[in-house]
């Protein structure tokens, strides 16, 4: 099984390899098989990454940053494989690697350009700040700088705030959008062009529901087919907003098909879950159940947020007692 990395072939004996932060990659190099094989891998023409000759590794003068991180495919050297297996790449490893191979027949030099990308799964959050409502798309660690786009009711929004924090390794990015008083649906897309990876967050506000005390409420939550892939691991969380913060009512993990319920009056229909319908029921409503309910369906590629506003009113019976 090869680690996650892909090669882009470009002219002049030069290849581009794209790897992910902290994952293993292979820097490819091949040669016409011959005896007396000498292999030297160097970084930026200066630092010794790996040396092999006279049938074994010679790492005495290897640059310390590569210690215990490199190896060759020793059983494949006689077949013309001088590729380097490179463990746990970091952004500091980006750059040009040169592979020198000498044999009894010839000397060849291959260049490999290593580019490293980072894309820790982004999140879409719904926040209340005083009387304002915000949607925030954020990614804790991303490299290179991503492209973030917002849409309202499928129409691109030009206004796009981006709060960026740069660290040695990568960027941390927040993109907030004020949605106070809006009933529109919103979509945020974060794209890492290097890793060719896109994440989408979608927010939908459902019509408000008015219920009487002691009744039950059914709140719908069905993923949009455009994003949802049942084969991919995902998590569903139902939360209730109370005094500006969300408390988790229940969650479901697709990988284990486990449902954890924190609120005894909450119920999920197992059959509906099997049909990828995560609608829920809340029984025996009381006045304090009024508020916003958030369904969050999240995977590595998307977050789907559905907001329901529930108003619980006193029943006639209760009103007449008062």
């Amino acid at each position: 099984i090869f680690p996650l990395a892909f090669f882009i072939y470009v002219p002049m004996n030069e290849q581009i390899v794209i790897g992910r932060l902290d994952e293993d990659i292979i820097l490819p190099s091949s040669f016409e098989r011959g005896s007396e094989v000498v292999i030297h891998w160097k970084y930026q023409d200066s630092y010794k990454v790996h040396s092999y000759y006279k049938g074994s590794d010679h790492l005495e003068s290897q640059d310390p940053r590569y210690a215990n991180r490199t190896s060759l495919f020793y059983n494949e050297i006689q077949n013309g494989n001088a590729s380097l297996f490179f463990r746990r790449v970091s952004l500091l490893d980006e750059g040009i690697y040169t592979c020198y191979v000498g044999t009894a027949i010839q000397v060849i030099t291959n260049k490999v350009v290593l580019k490293v990308g980072v894309f820790l799964t982004p999140v879409m959050k719904y926040e209340k700040r005083n009387t304002n409502s915000f949607l925030i798309c954020s990614v804790l660690s991303v490299y290179p700088r991503p492209i973030i786009t917002w849409k309202m009711d499928n129409t691109p929004i030009s206004e796009n705030n981006m709060e960026e924090t740069g660290s040695l390794d990568s960027f941390s990015i927040n993109s907030p959008l004020n949605i106070t008083g809006s009933n529109s649906s919103y979509e945020c897309t974060i794209e890492n062009s290097l890793l060719k990876q896109t994440w989408t967050g979608r927010w939908t506000m459902k019509d408000g529901l008015h219920k009487m005390q002691s009744e039950h409420v059914s709140l719908s939550c069905q993923p949009v087919n455009d994003y949802f892939s049942p084969n991919q691991d995902f998590k569903v969380t139902w939360s209730r907003m109370k005094s500006g913060t969300f408390s988790v009512l229940a969650y479901y993990l697709s990988s284990s098909q486990n449902t954890i319920i924190n609120e005894s009056r909450f119920s999920w229909n197992k059959e509906l879950i099997n049909q990828s319908d995560f609608s829920m029921n809340l029984m025996d409503l009381n006045l304090s159940d009024s508020g916003e309910y958030l369904c969050n369906i999240s995977s590595d590629e998307y977050t789907l947020l559905t907001i329901h506003t529930v108003h619980v009113e006193p029943s006639q019976e209760t009103a007449s007692h008062n």
């Epitope: 000498v38 006279k54 003068s61 044999t103 030099t109």
Partner: antibody, heavy 121, light 107 residues
Framework: QVQLVESGGGVVQPGRSLRLSCAAS????????IHWVRQAPGKGLEWVAV????????YYADSVRGRFTISRDNSKNTLSLQMNSLRVEDTAVYYC??????????????WGQGTLVTVSS | DIQMTQSPSTLSASVGDRVTITCRAS??????LAWYQQKPGKAPKLLIY???SLESGVPSRFSGSGSGTEFTLTISSLQPDDLATYYC?????????FGQGTKLEIK
């Protein structure tokens, strides 16, 4: 065809310095390690020093370490041996010789014709 | 340093003879051994590398064998052109060292 031509030999007094050169042609100079090997008159061969293809590594025989310095200029296809604090026992024909590849293998595929260094008072 | 000892120091043989020169290392050098031929007034010439691999362009009457500490160079049928001194050389580790040479004379 591969050619290595040494120059710079001559007669020098003990304690003095001399610089030998080796001009290379017929191959991609920057791909190969080059060695200096010497042979005292009527005696056997003695390896002196090696410099790798990219000049990243240089190694010397114990008998010359600290006195001789090997260097190369890949843009000019030339190799040099700076010899300081010369001794009578350094008298020899000095050959430059090309390694099989980078300099790491350590045997000599092509040789120059040699240049004679005589250290005498 | 690894010492290399060649025997004999001189050898006299007739054209057509099978000639064997021996080289001993003071410690194991695996197969990292080369043989050279040096004719009078000339630079040495590589014959054999890695103990038994024949260098390109070298006549097939030359062959090498051995590993560890004991090595031999064999000329299967001596030719007048083979008049020369022969050297073994270890390249297992720095410093690279040569045998003292075997002078081959034609009877």
């Amino acid at each position: 065809q591969v050619q290595l031509v040494e120059s710079g030999g001559g007669v020098v007094q003990p304690g003095r310095s001399l610089r030998l050169s080796c001009a290379a042609s017929g191959f991609t100079f920057s791909d190969y390690g080059i060695h200096w090997v010497r042979q005292a008159p009527g005696k056997g061969l003695e390896w002196v020093a090696v410099i790798w293809y990219d000049a990243s590594d240089k190694y010397y025989a114990d008998s010359v370490r600290g006195r001789f310095t090997i260097s190369r200029d890949n843009s000019k296809n030339t190799l040099s041996l700076q010899m300081n604090s010369l001794r009578v026992e350094d008298t020899a024909v000095y050959y430059c010789a090309r390694d099989r590849s980078s300099g790491a293998m350590g045997y000599f595929v092509y040789w120059g014709q040699g240049t004679l260094v005589t250290v005498s008072s | 340093d690894i010492q290399m000892t060649q025997s004999p120091s001189t050898l006299s043989a007739s054209v057509g003879d099978r000639v064997t020169i021996t080289c001993r290392a003071s410690q194991s050098i695996s197969s990292w051994l080369a043989w050279y031929q040096q004719k009078p007034g000339k630079a040495p010439k590589l014959l054999i590398y890695k103990a038994s691999s024949l260098e390109s362009g070298v006549p097939s009457r030359f062959s090498g064998s051995g590993s560890g500490t004991e090595f031999t160079l064999t000329i299967s049928s001596l030719q007048p052109d083979d008049l020369a001194t022969y050297y073994c050389q270890q390249y297992q580790s720095y410093s690279y060292t040569f045998g003292q040479g075997t002078k081959l004379e034609i009877k």
